[in-house]
């Protein structure tokens, strides 16, 4: 039994400093340190085939695929790419390992694919497979998974037509409601495409790739559960597959399940049944209703009936195009500085939306929760009592939706002052928006109580900073006022704040900040 050679596959990324294009096995370039690609024998394959982790390369990047072989004696090799043989010149490194390289300069679409390296040593022959793909995030997609019945088996296949190829996993849970949250101990994940165990309470399939993760839940009617107050509703687009599972548990096997659409039994071939005994010897039956590609006439009330349970229905609605239903009128809120408050959007949508909350050009993660009435809700509480404009944006590939919120925080004004050669300005951001007074400080009025009636120009809510209104007041200076101290005061229902300014001085001169509540 011959020991296999020790094979190491690495990727070397090069910083391009040349514009030539082609393949070579010795090319001077600035290189980053090699990245191991975990070369391993491909399981259950005929012959000795090693496989490297898939390599993703940016367009125009230059790389070297390299194999290091610990095997005695000489080696000969051949690269094959898209049925063409390419020159291969092995050499030996200081550790006396055979080194075979393939340089790909200025990566293009035509250079993506499978690179096969055939190596012949004195002891054995083997093949090394490199898969090189272009990392083009513009071409990346992540599609919601859907279900198909496995041919001649009572099993479901989960399919997600995504790029790069996603990792598909089943997420199974046998509890109810909250305990079936993703991170719950009750949740079991199974990283494979086919699922045979179809009796669980909650069954989801998820697909993940570089763009994130998308999941689809197997729509289920459980005849042993109390029906929801509102009829469950399932939306699908024309051409999508329909899957509904009806589940029932009874003390013995003496019961049957049937599906009807608008009081008509489903056609043969559009349902299948499975049954099993549970640990307490009760019988579990499930009956799937499925349509491989729905049309408008598949809309209606699907009713699951049992000879031993009350029947339950679901409304299946087939739409031509996805939708997002919600009121898009803008909403204004006024809260106290320490009041707990969350923005909330209630919507009905199909397919499921992706959403963001945005404030001050920053995006925040968006969580959505399904409600019993078929609606969903997204809340945003992380406003940290910052006043301004908050935007909820949702999209699902077919529809887009944007809703604006304004948050005002009730607080007394805070004044900022500055002076130039010809005028003095004060601004404040308190809410409700403040009103202004200007006072002159003089020998006659050391407490600055003498009103300045002229030359004042108020701009209420003139400047919007991320939706936050700012009020300002400007005093145009007369020659007679130069060298005097003046005081600007902003006041609203929560208090007053003042700043004192020395006129005819460049730059801001808030000597004293008065706070009069």
């Amino acid at each position: 039994n011959q020991d296999l050679p020790v094979i190491k596959c690495v990727l070397i990324n090069h910083k391009n400093n040349d514009s030539s294009v082609g393949k070579s096995s010795s090319y001077p370039m600035v290189s980053e340190s090699p990245e191991d690609l975990g070369c391993a024998l491909r399981p259950q394959s005929a012959g000795t085939v090693y496989e490297a982790a898939t390599v993703e390369v940016d367009v125009s990047a230059s790389i070297t695929l390299q194999v290091l072989v610990d095997t005695p004696g000489n080696i000969s090799c051949l690269w094959v790419f898209k049925h063409s043989s390419l020159n291969c010149q092995p050499h030996f490194d200081v550790q006396n390992r055979g080194v075979v390289s393939m340089v790909i300069l200025k990566m293009t679409e035509t250079q993506a694919g499978e690179y096969l390296l055939f190596i012949q040593s004195e002891a054995t022959n083997y093949t090394i497979l490199f898969t090189v793909s272009i990392r083009n995030t513009l071409l990346f997609t992540l599609r919601r998974p859907y279900f198909r019945k496995m041919e001649n088996q009572d099993a479901l296949v989960c399919i997600s037509e995504s790029v790069p190829e996603p990792i598909v996993e089943w997420v199974l849970c046998d509890s109810q409601g909250e305990s079936c949250k993703e991170e719950s101990p009750a949740v079991v994940k199974k990283e494979e495409k086919v699922l045979h165990e179809l009796f669980g309470t909650d069954i989801r399939c998820c697909a993940r790739n570089e763009l994130g993760r998308e999941c689809t839940r197997l729509f289920t009617i459980d005849l042993n559960q109390t029906p929801q107050t509102t009829l469950p509703q399932l939306f699908l687009k024309v051409g999508e597959p329909l899957w509904i599972r009806c589940k029932a548990v009874h003390v013995n096997h003496g019961f049957g399940l049937t599906w009807e659409l608008e009081n008509k039994a489903l056609e043969e071939g559009s349902y299948f049944e499975m049954s099993t005994y549970s640990t307490n010897r009760t019988m579990i039956r499930i009956l799937f209703a499925f349509v491989s590609s729905v049309a408008r006439n598949d809309t209606g009330y699907y009713t699951c009936s049992s000879s031993k349970h009350p029947s339950q229905s679901a409304l299946v609605t087939i739409v031509e195009k996805g939708f997002i239903n919600a009121t898009n009128s803008s909403e204004d809120y006024e809260i106290d500085q320490y009041e707990e408050f969350c923005f909330s959007v209630r919507f009905k949508a199909y397919p499921q939306i992706r959403c963001t909350w945005t404030f001050s050009r920053k995006s925040f993660p968006c969580e959505q929760k399904g409600l019993d009435d078929g609606y969903s809700v997204s809340k945003f509480c992380n406003h940290k009592h910052q006043p301004g404009e908050y935007i909820f944006h949702a999209e699902n590939g077919d529809a887009q939706f944007t809703k604006m919120f304004t948050l005002n925080i009730r607080r007394k004004p805070q004044v900022l002052a500055e002076a130039s050669a010809s005028q003095a300005s004060c601004s404040s951001d308190g809410y409700p928006l403040p009103s202004w007074t200007w006072k002159k400080c003089s020998d006659k009025s050391p407490n600055c109580t003498e009103d300045i009636p002229e030359g004042v120009w108020n701009r209420k809510a003139n400047r919007k900073v991320f939706g936050q209104w700012v009020s300002s007041s400007t005093l145009n200076m007369s020659e007679a006022m130069k060298g005097f101290l003046v005081k600007c005061c902003a006041y609203n229902s929560l208090g007053t704040s003042c700043e004192t300014i020395l006129l005819n001085s460049p730059g801001p001169f808030p000597f004293i900040q008065d706070s009069i509540s």
């Epitope: 690609l37 975990g38 399981p43 982790a53 898939t54 898969t131 790069p164 079991v188 199974k190 570089e210």
Partner: antibody
Framework: QVTLKESGPVLVKPTETLTLTCTVS??????????VSWIRQPPGKTLEWLAH???????SYSTSLKSRLTISKDTSKSQVVLTMTNMDPVDTATYYC????????????????WGQGTLVTVSS | DIQMTQSPSSVSASVGDRVTITCRAS??????LAWYQQKPGKAPKRLIY???SLQSGVPSRFSGSGSGTEFTLTISSLQPEDFATYYC?????????FGGGTKVEIK
């Protein structure tokens, strides 16, 4: 040369939070087909998988310890960090990080490289 | 969670002996099983992956077989450096679970 190196405190008091860092070299955490796991081994006992993280930030946790664990990564520093809250003497173990590799034909490259491990003792 | 039952928990053998270790999964895990060798004070080292594929650089006296729920690690002719503890790992289901270990000792 692929290496993974664990670092963190050797002694933790009960109820405290443990933070361990795994610094990797020789492969990239940016590679969509690479992931890093944390595994622990109490003295004289078997191995226990704790958590892993994929390049797209997808995370999975041990069901029994899920509420106490958080895994994260800093790709630019080639580091994966595990935090474990509310430490107890039964959490005394050698903590390892290990690599996972995915191939075109499946994710069968579980734990082909390991760190040397770091022994964490929980004691007051 | 999937239980991985490894047997025997320990085995005494001599150099040159054939040693067989078994791992049983509480449900079907297909080929998603790996075998590791661990020596005292060291990190585990992978020997076999995908139930029967030999890790590069591992001597061919180690072999793995099985699928579904029954798996076997065989050392065809025990060498002095093979005295260690061996663990199986299933990675078909979350959470990933290891067997209890088999200690191979010198007779």
């Amino acid at each position: 040369q692929v290496t993974l190196k664990e670092s963190g405190p050797v002694l933790v008091k009960p109820t405290e939070t443990l933070t361990l860092t795994c610094t990797v070299s020789g492969f990239s955490l940016r590679n969509a087909r690479m992931a890093v796991s944390w595994i622990r081994q109490p003295p004289g006992k078997t191995l226990e998988w704790l958590a892993h993280i994929f390049s797209n930030d997808e995370k999975s946790y041990s069901t029994s310890l899920k509420s106490r664990l958080t895994i994260s990564k800093d790709t630019s520093k080639s580091q994966v960090v595990l935090t474990m809250t509310n430490m107890d003497p039964v959490d005394t173990a050698t903590y390892y990080c290990a690599r996972i590799v995915g191939y075109g034909s499946g994710w069968y490259g579980y734990f082909d490289y390991w760190g040397q491990g770091t022994l964490v003792t929980v004691s007051s | 969670d999937i239980q991985m039952t490894q047997s025997p928990s320990s085995v005494s053998a001599s150099v040159g002996d054939r040693v067989t270790i078994t791992c049983r999964a509480s449900q079907d895990i297909r080929y998603d099983l790996a075998w590791y060798q661990q020596k005292p004070g060291k990190a585990p080292k992978r020997l076999i992956y995908a139930a029967s594929s030999l890790q590069s650089g591992v001597p061919s006296r180690f072999s793995g077989s099985g699928s579904g729920t029954e798996f076997t690690l065989t050392i065809s002719s025990l060498q002095p450096e093979d005295f260690a503890t061996y663990y199986c790992l299933q990675h078909n289901f979350y959470p990933l679970t290891f067997g209890g270990g088999t200690k191979v000792e010198i007779k």
